[in-house]
């Protein structure tokens, strides 16, 4: 329970906080425990204890072992282990699994990525982030204290993010990175009744006879993906396939558009070479989903060709 | 009892047609989106088609579009498949299912078969 | 099209065992998965729906949990009546997408 596994590359620093918390006061001594050699306080070894804090500045991989930290007060020790191991650098981007702190999930409505144990470190901004080894760069990243502010999330946003530090101890600098995996959450959308936004109910549509006239039912349905969702044309509450008129047809497929941030569709009713007889028809267009069927009829009526004569 | 029940199963050549129904009872037919989920034999089940409640809206899997067609009659309580062009992978129990709370398949028919051999 | 993975592929196990099994979504569903049972020669049987709320009259050893892609159903006391193949399914977004199964049987 009081033990604690940290990690780091070698020529990096790293820090480790004791597992066993007490106050300020008490006296907290490290030791090693395969040797239980004392580590020693002066600042000047590279591998040195400073209260609650087992620095290492900078880490090699010899360093990896287990560490006993006694925290001492006047009527109780609490004995904690840091199980620390410090890696070689590796040569390619890749991190490996052992090199990840824990994953987090954004969406669009947070998308703070926080640099893990950058607390324990005595940094100075700015903090460096990168995305699959790659520098971030653009207007929608903003590096703001010890956390990465992603602008307008998209699930290609999710990988692995790296941040990286300047670690100061008395005047000297040591290089720090931690890496952690971010996922993108689809924020979770919801369906509606459908809402037709065209045509309006009961429209009357000028069309000429003899040409083409297009006709647009569109609806919405709620936000982010849609289960089950559709729009269609019916002719006198029949379905356009089974109405039998190869002059009337309904586009293939429905095309999904966003509006205000819902989720919509539309479908185009062609009417080609227009005749007279198609003026007797109802249309109807038809938006469903599991919530229910809303319906907006349509008529068609001519449109007076325009009087060229004075 | 609310149940499913299909029918119309059988052995057909590479390339014909077979039709499937599925009689309903039980409950409010018409209240409910429709579906057929196959299974192959040996292998997992594969959601095949689906209709809406008045069967003005229908949604079909890829491997199937525009060779089966489901379709409703609801004054018969009974849902149907017509398959056209069988090829050898169609083989498989199919079976129909009501689609109820939370989008889930909670009723199922016991299953027809149709196989499709030369 | 969302492809749903389950692991493991198989397993077996005794009967008071805890079994757990887990399916993953290629993208993120909500909470718009559900867990089947199918036994031999027999239609698949709704155990749990919307991620982890129990079927009417299925038994509470059952549960489920999990949301976005990761998603879990556990057996918390197998009985001899629970070997079967059991299978998760999407309603996120069409085309409906299954796994491809976890068949638990006897040790």
């Known amino acids: 329970k009081f033990s604690k596994q940290s990690w780091g590359l070698e020529n990096e620093a790293l820090i480790v906080r004791c597992p066993r918390q007490g106050k300020p006061s008490y006296t907290v001594d490290w030791y090693y425990s395969q040797t239980n050699k004392s580590i020693p306080t002066q600042e000047r070894n590279r591998v040195f204890a400073s209260g609650q804090l087992l620095k290492f500045l900078p880490a090699a991989v010899a360093d990896s072992g287990i560490y006993t930290c006694i925290v001492r007060s006047p009527t109780f020790n609490r004995t904690g282990y840091a199980n620390v191991t410090i890696y070689k650098k590796q040569s390619d981007c890749n991190v490996p699994d052992y090199l990840m702190y824990s994953t987090v999930s954004g969406s669009e409505k947070n998308s703070k990525i926080y640099c893990p144990t950058i607390d324990l470190y005595n940094w100075t901004a700015p903090l460096e982030w990168f995305k699959n080894c790659q520098a971030l760069q653009g207007s929608r990243y903003r590096a703001h204290k010890s956390f990465l502010v992603i602008d307008n999330v998209m699930t290609e946003d999710a990988g692995d993010y790296t941040c990286k530090f300047i670690h100061n101890e008395n005047g000297a600098n040591y290089s720090v990175t931690a890496t952690r995996s971010f996922t993108v959450k689809d924020e979770q959308g919801f369906s509606l009744f459908p809402v037709i936004g065209a045509p309006a109910q009961n429209e009357i549509k000028e069309v000429e006879i003899g040409k083409n006239a297009n006709l647009t039912c569109s609806a919405c349905f709620g936000k982010g993906t849609q289960f089950l969702a559709a729009v269609l044309w019916q002719l006198n509450g029949t379905k356009i396939t089974d109405f039998g008129e190869p002059r009337i047809q309904q586009e293939e497929g429905q095309n999904q558009s966003f509006s205000n941030g819902l989720a919509c569709l539309d479908m185009v009713l062609r009417i080609a070479d227009v005749k007279e007889e198609d003026l007797l028809l109802q249309y109807d267009c038809l938006a469903l989903n599991l919530h229910g069927l809303r319906r907006h009829t349509v008529r068609l009526s001519r449109k007076n060709p325009i009087d060229h004569h004075s | 009892e609310v149940q499913l029940l299909e029918s119309g199963g059988g052995l057909v050549q590479p390339g014909g047609s077979l039709r499937l129904s599925c009689a309903a009872s039980?409950?409010?037919?018409?209240?409910?989106?429709m579906n057929w989920v196959r299974q192959a034999p040996g292998k997992g089940l594969e959601w095949v088609s689906t209709i809406s409640g008045f069967g003005e809206s229908t949604f079909y899997a890829d491997s199937v579009k525009g060779r089966f067609t489901i379709s409703r009659d609801n004054s018969k309580n009974t849902l149907y498949l017509q398959m056209n062009s069988l090829r050898a992978e169609d083989t498989a129990v199919y079976y129909c299912a009501r689609l109820g709370a939370a989008r889930a398949f909670d009723i199922w028919g016991q299953g027809t078969t149709v196989t499709v051999s030369s | 099209d969302i492809q749903m993975t389950q692991s493991p592929s198989s397993l077996s196990a005794s009967v008071g065992d805890r079994v757990t099994i887990t399916c993953r979504a290629s993208q993120s569903i909500g909470s718009w998965m559900a867990w089947y049972q199918q036994k031999p020669g027999k239609a698949p049987k709704l155990l749990i729906y919307?991620?982890?709320t129990l079927q009417s009259g299925v038994p509470s050893r059952f549960s489920g949990s999990g949301s976005g892609t990761d998603f879990t159903l556990t057996i918390s006391s197998l009985q001899p009546e629970d070997f079967a193949t059991y299978y998760c399914?999407?309603?996120?977004?069409?085309?409906?997408?299954f796994g491809p199964g976890t068949k638990v049987d006897i040790k």
């Open positions: 919307a991620a982890s």
């Open positions: 399914q999407q309603s996120y977004t069409t085309p409906i997408t």
């Open positions: 039980g409950f409010t037919f018409s209240d409910y989106y």
